[in-house]
Structures are given as C-alpha cells and as structure tokens.
Amino acid sequence: EVEKTACPSGKKAREIDESLIFYKKWELEACVDAALLATQMDRVNAIPFTYEQLDVLKHKLDELYPQGYPESVIQHLGYLFLKMSPEDIRKWNVTSLETLKALLEVNKGHEMSPQVATLIDRFVKGRGQLDKDTLDTLTAFYPGYLCSLSPEELSSVPPSSIWAVRPQDLDTCDPRQLDVLYPKARLAFQNMNGSEYFVKIQSFLGGAPTEDLKALSQQNVSMDLATFMKLRTDAVLPLTVAEVQKLLGPHVEGLKAEERHRPVRDWILRQRQDDLDTLGLGLQGGIPNGYLVLDLSMQEALS
C-alpha cells in the first residue's frame, strides 16, 4: 500500500509518457490521475515500467473502478494483465473477442495461468456458448483448451464451432470428452460427401458408437491403425471380422502388430478363430470351433 503524499510541484502528470519511469512509487501514486491513466492505458504497454511501478498503476485503477474495470480499460491492459488476480478478473465483463485476443497475446507462450483460465471462463459465460470464433482463438493460443473442458461444458459447444477444431486439439481428450464432441462433429459435417466427411470426422471417432462404425465400414474409408486404436473398446467389440476388414481396408494387416493391445486384443477374444483365420494374418486367441458363445449381458437381463 502506497502512502498518500502530495505531488511535488511541477511533477503532476499531464499525460502517460516515458518520463514517468523516473518517478518513485509514491510520486506515481501522488502525481498520476487515475482517470488520465484509464483513458491512456494503451500507452502503458510501450513504457518500460518496473513491476513495482505497475503495482502502483494497478492500485490506482482498482481505486477508480472498485466494481471491476470497464472493457475500454481491459482491452489495453497489456502486461498489467499479468498483475491481475483471478478475483480481479471475476469482476470484469469481457464481451469483445478483440479484448480476449489482446490479453491472451500477453500470456502467449506460457501455460494457461489461473488468470487466463478465469478470463476465458468469464468470456465464454458472457457469450452463453463457445462459438466458432472464440474456439478458433482459444485453440490457436492453447491447443489443449478443448480437452481441458468438462463433458458438461463441452455439451454447450455448438456444432459450427467444431469446424475450428484441428486434430492436434483433441490429442489430450479422454473418451468421455470425445463422447460429447463426436455427435457434434457428426452434425457439423453432415452436409459433406463420403470421402470429405471421413477426413473431417476421423479425429473425433474415439467417441463413435458401434452403429456408426458399422455404417463407416460400408463406405470404403480405409481407416488407419492409429485411428482404429483410439476407438472405444466397447464400440469395437461387436464388430464382425468382415466389418473390421472393410473398415481398415489395406490397413487390416496392421492388426497383427497390435494384437496384444486394446482394443484389438479384446476384439480378437470375441471373434471365432475360423473368422480370424480368413484374414490370413495369423491372429490367435479367438473362440475355438465348436464352442458356444453366450451373451452374458443378455443373460443378466433375463435373470
């Protein structure tokens, strides 16, 4: 807290300029008018203030705007943003994407800080949903942003936003998140034809149910093994050998290298060995000839 002292004669700031870097903390407090600072915030960023001096400037703004800064000030905070606490940011009402971009730029190259997380949360809540332009911006700064959201938060993502998602944005998503995003992607891309559709939907297939995988198997899509290995095990298990063969096309040979890993391992255990042998890959572990296959889930339902 800076003590209240009178401004020395001739030192009253008429504008925010470089001469202020020579002011001591108490002089900044006494000689810089908060209203002047607010109207000339855009100049602060160009002046090499020390962290201590920035603390004083923040204090002046806090006094002027105890209920939270207006967006005209927030947009020009620049490095002063790094001085803000999540509690400060919760008082803000940020509606402009330009303001969001300006503040994210300040934090660029760093991991998402609590301040940035709070800012994004305030912005998205203010907009009501995570629209395409916002998602575009956020994933550009933080590729893992989408996967940091809960399934409940993801449910408010409109399908049009999915167009902004790049494959790498989904790298850290878990199956629960993909369960929510996949139906959105299906809706978003539904006007595309077969081959284009598959290219777009491929990254989201970790959330696809069995029905959709069966339908895809009829489309000559030639899914690569990397994508197949990311599919939900429970969605893969009911697929027949013929369906997996159609789904993978020429990539079916890659099953051999993955036979000990999920979901391939579990899928093999569910297939008849006879059927697996038709692939000619030497896959072992299927149900031997003559064995009866009981559907235990059906048995449970009956008991």
């Epitope: 996949y182 959105k184 539904q190 006007n191 895809l216 009829q218 489309q219």
Partner: antibody
Framework: EVQLVQSGAEVKKPGASVKVSCKAS????????VQWVRQAPGQGLEWMGI????????TYAQKFQGRVTMTRDTSTSTVYMELSSLRSEDTAVYYC???????????????WGQGTLVTVSS | SYELTQPPSVSVSPGQTASITCSGD??????ASWYQQKPGQSPVLVIY???RRPSGIPERFSGSNSGNTATLTISGTQAMDEADYYC?????????FGTGTKVTVL
C-alpha cells in the same frame, strides 16, 4: 414394429415448465439419436434439438437455448424434453423422433412419436 | 437465419406428376430431406440426403437438389399422397424446415 410412445397432453400456465417423455418399445432404443420437433396449431414444423444415444451430448436450436433440456434414462429407454419459462407461443404438439437409418452421416427422423399437445394458457 | 421457402400449395390430378420445390441460399451444398404429414398424424420421412428413399417408401417418390433448389417429385400421384410436405436441411447449428406445401389430389 418399433414405436415411440409419448406422455399425455398437458395444460400449463405461463412461466411454468413442462416435461414430455418419449419411451420406445424394443431393446435397441439406446443405440439411436432422438430429436424433438414441435408444431404450433396450423403451423409448420420447428426443430428443437437432439440428444445422442448415451445421453451425454445434446445440441439445441439457438431459439430454445437456455430454456430446453433434453435428458435420457437408458435404464428405462426413455428420453425427456423439458421446456421452461413457458409462454402462450409455446402451445404446440411436441414430437420426439428417432434416427434409425444407418447412413454414416445420416440424421433422418425415421420413427416418430404420436405427439404431445402442450397448451400454455392463463 | 437460414430460410427454406416452399409454394403453399400444389394441385395434381391422379396419375400425374407433382413437383414440390424448396428454395434456400446454396441449398445444393447441403443435403435435403422431405417429410410427409397427413392431417392429425405424425410426419413421415420420404426422402433423405437429396434423393434416397427409406425402406417402405414407394418408388414414385424421388428427390433432387442443386443450386438453390431441392425438388420432391411424386410420379403417378395417388389419392393417398394428399398431405403436407416439408423440406428440411441442416444449416450452421440447426435443422431448418421449409414453410410446407399442401398437395391436393384433384
């Protein structure tokens, strides 16, 4: 033959909420998307939203955002549509419809419920 | 918001061909579906993805879509085809239904 059976007609006061249910006969209901469409008296069809097979993902028409909630009880093969802050303009027949076709990017509404008339009147 | 416009009514004699149009900006870039609705009944899907027929729908129903217009054609129209018909397409974040066309079989 698969059927979607909806709950009965409702009369509600403005500002209230209504919850319409849609139950499927048959064991495969939980494998399909369910959509909701409404039709005001003498008017055309209006899409409200969609819920995925597991019930974890919903997409609502912008017009109903914040007022509509679609949920799914997979144990009873029932989907629910709740509309809040009702006004007289919400008086309509509300339909649930299921996407059963197997097209890989297909969302046609193949099987429809019989409709539920919701009347909003003071 | 996206709009799909249909003629309010179309009249056709039994055995003749009825064509119902549905106009929307760049509609040809989207897949169009068509629903039939008879008085007091729930709608029935008759065409999806521009020109595909669900099982159980008679061959006399066909569809096309290009430019700004999708068309539902009923060849050899029968009295039982008298109904309201709605086109539908996905735009941005919602399904949009057309204004509806009442087909009367004279």
């Amino acid at each position: 033959e698969v059927q979607l059976v909806q709950s009965g007609a409702e009369v509600k006061k403005p500002g209230a909420s209504v919850k319409v249910s849609c139950k499927a006969s048959g064991d495969t209901f939980n494998r399909y998307y369910v959509q909701w469409v409404r039709q005001a008296p003498g008017q055309g069809l209006e899409w409200m939203g969609i819920i995925n097979p597991s019930g974890v993902s919903t997409t609502y028409a912008q017009k109903f955002q914040g007022r509509v909630t679609m949920t799914r009880d997979t144990s009873t093969s029932t989907v629910y549509m709740e509309l809040s802050s009702l006004r007289s303009e919400d008086t309509a027949v509300y339909y649930c419809a299921e996407t059963r076709g197997s097209g890989f990017n297909y969302f046609g509404m193949d099987v429809w419920g019989q409709g539920t008339l919701v009347t909003v009147s003071s | 918001s996206y709009e799909l416009t249909q003629p309010p009514s179309v009249s056709v004699s039994p055995g003749q061909t009825a064509s119902i149009t549905c106009s929307g900006d760049k509609l040809g870039d989207k897949y169009a579906s068509w629903y039939q609705q008879k008085p007091g009944q729930s709608p029935v899907l008759v065409i999806y993805q521009d020109n595909r027929r669900p099982s159980g729908i008679p061959e006399r129903f066909s569809g096309s879509n290009s430019g700004n217009t999708a068309t539902l054609t009923i060849s050899g129209t029968q009295a039982m085809d008298e109904a309201d018909y709605y086109c539908q397409a996905w735009d941005s974040d919602t399904y949009v239904f057309g204004t509806g066309t009442k087909v009367t079989v004279l």
